[in-house]
Amino acid sequence: AVNGTSQFTCFYNSRANISCVWSQDGALQDTSCQVHAWPDRRRWNQTCELLPVSQASWACNLILGAPDSQKLTTVDIVTLRVLCREGVRWRVMAIQDFKPFENLRLMAPISLQVVHVETHRCNISWEISQASHYFERHLEFEARTLSPGHTWEEAPLLTLKQKQEWICLETLTPDTQYEFQVRVKPLQGEFTTWSPWSQPLAFRTKPAALGKDT
């Protein structure tokens, strides 16, 4: 038997993926566990194997279909269960009735690239991945730039309150190495959260021309 507190958190990426994390104090080390998804109004059901991500937490991704297919809507309720093997039987460790569009977390933005770089500014673009057509252009972004000698946590957040998949960073220092990250969030959903940060994009500003400032 398993004692201790259990937490089971899942997010829908708005298309065809539900990602779940299950954490359990006093957890089972060598037990096989899985997440089972059972929608109330769809003909499919899906399972994924929970894999350890730390001492007492496991994660898995329920792949519901092709990455850009719209597999769920606002009226769907998906019963999500954590099942762990106990001998020849499966034991239910956690259960929730999951409303996908109340628990959104989009995929991190992808394809970051430097469009144009100068001595004091840099134009960067990105793309969003697997976001539902329901949102249309109504998304918001946060971006941050890592300066030399600072940490990501110290970086000020830049907020873009519309679906703008580019940014022009200003007042940069010439001939300096920077890193840039962006994340995205839809407007919908009581428990919706920001996407993970994108992979950092490294860039270097141009050196100042001798005798003048560009």
Epitope: R41, V75, H138
Partner: nanobody, 119 residues
Framework: EVQLVESGGTLVQTGGSLRLSCVVS????????MGWYRQVPGKQRELVAD???????KYGDSVKGRFTIVRDSVKNTVYLQMSSLNPEDTGVYYC?????????????WGQGTQVTVTS
């Protein structure tokens, strides 16, 4: 402004058939679900049938096998084909649409259409 307009409600005899229609019109929206609910005096509004994107229909227990919901996403219209009607099907039938407008989802209701089944 979004509008839902129902039509087709009338007086019909037990065992008869009826088709209700509901059309959604107005400013720019995307619908992800459309359906029908009914209300009889003194009772809660109850689900008759709805259909979400992906073609998944859901029916109330009392109408399964007798009623069929059809959704035309291009015309933003939903139909309810009712057959083998009985007096218990009497009530006001309301159309409901789940609409995405400017990145947020809300439910919208029609004014209702009266269906009366006589024995």
């Amino acid at each position: 402004e979004v509008q839902l307009v129902e039509s087709g409600g009338t007086l019909v005899q037990t065992g008869g058939s009826l088709r209700l229609s509901c059309v959604v019109s107005g400013s720019h929206f995307i619908s992800d679900v459309m359906g029908w609910y009914r209300q009889v005096p003194g009772k809660q509004r109850e689900l008759v049938a709805d259909m979400a994107d992906g073609g998944s229909a859901k029916y109330g227990d009392s109408v399964k096998g007798r009623f069929t919901i059809v959704r035309d996403s291009v015309k933003n219209t939903v139909y309810l084909q009712m057959s083998s009607l009985n007096p218990e099907d009497t009530g006001v039938y309301y159309c409901k649409a789940g609409l995405w407008i400017k990145g947020r989802h809300s439910d919208y209701w029609g004014q209702g259409t009266q269906v009366t089944v006589t024995s």
